[in-house]
Interface confidence: low
């Protein structure tokens, strides 16, 4: 079953190549076990950036060497992915799983993008 | 240093089914995309299927999709390839492999660090 999920259209990482962003989804039924996925589109080709499934009201657990780290507050997911740089410019998509209790419901948002600007780097001093 | 073992394959007749199971050691392996590829006799290795570190993302080539299917355990550290409605053009050895991102289903063999030694697929009646 489809389920509509939200998220801002343009984000800006910082100089240390972090960026943050809401995921917000508009949940049928009480949840209490969703998984979270953070796709990126660019050239065509779609990748998986990381994945996380969480009990509500628990914090996302990503993979140890995982880019993202997330904190969930009812029907909001507080996304951040750290380590960008210029060549990961592109547009991230998230994407919500109700995995349970049943029915099953997935919805896809119409992805961020997101802008990463190599700092210059600091001139020798002499 | 990452080291795969292939297993599960055999003779099977046309239509039927096998499961290969590739098992990992290592943690590299566990925590980045990876993929079957085959190589039947005489051909070159080609690709058959790829999935992410997360098992959130799957590719599939056109002349498996809809008939094999890829998953992974990560507790187990355990790839595995679902075959289903084989066909004799199946026929190859069927090696699994690591790649050397997390996220990237990537298509070519130079994108892939680590391979196992290969499990011999034979579809004939």
């Known amino acids: 079953k489809a389920m509509h999920v939200a998220q801002p259209a343009v984000v800006l990482a910082n100089s240390r190549g972090t960026a943050s962003f809401v995921c917000e989804y508009a949940s049928p039924g009480k949840a209490t076990e969703v998984r979270v996925t953070v796709l990126r589109q660019a050239d065509s080709q779609v990748t998986e950036v990381c994945a996380a499934t969480y009990m509500m009201g628990n914090e996302l657990t990503f993979l140890d060497d995982s880019i993202c780290t997330g904190t969930s507050s009812g029907n909001q997911v507080n996304l951040t992915i750290q380590g960008l740089r210029a060549m990961d410019t592109g547009l991230y998509i998230c994407k919500v799983e109700l995995m349970y209790p049943p029915p099953y419901y997935m919805g896809i948002g119409n992805g961020t993008q997101i802008y990463v600007i190599d700092p210059e780097p600091c001139p020798d001093s002499d | 240093e990452v080291q795969l073992v292939e297993s599960g394959g055999g003779l099977v007749q046309p239509g039927g089914s096998l499961r290969l199971s590739c098992a990992a050691s290592g943690r590299t392996a566990s925590s980045n995309a990876m993929a079957w590829f085959r190589q039947a006799p005489g051909k070159e290795r080609e690709f058959v299927s790829a999935i992410s570190a997360t098992g959130g993302l799957t590719a599939y080539a056109d002349s498996v999709k809809g008939r094999f299917t890829i998953s992974r355990d990560n507790s187990k550290n355990t790839l595995y390839l679902q075959m289903n409605s084989l066909r004799a053009e199946d026929t190859a050895v069927y090696y699994c492999?690591?790649?050397?991102?997390?996220?990237?289903?990537?298509?070519?063999?130079?994108?892939?660090?680590?391979w196992g030694q290969g499990t011999l697929v034979t579809v004939s009646s």
């Open positions: 492999a690591v790649g050397r991102e997390r996220w990237y289903l990537r298509h070519t063999e130079n994108e892939y660090d680590y």
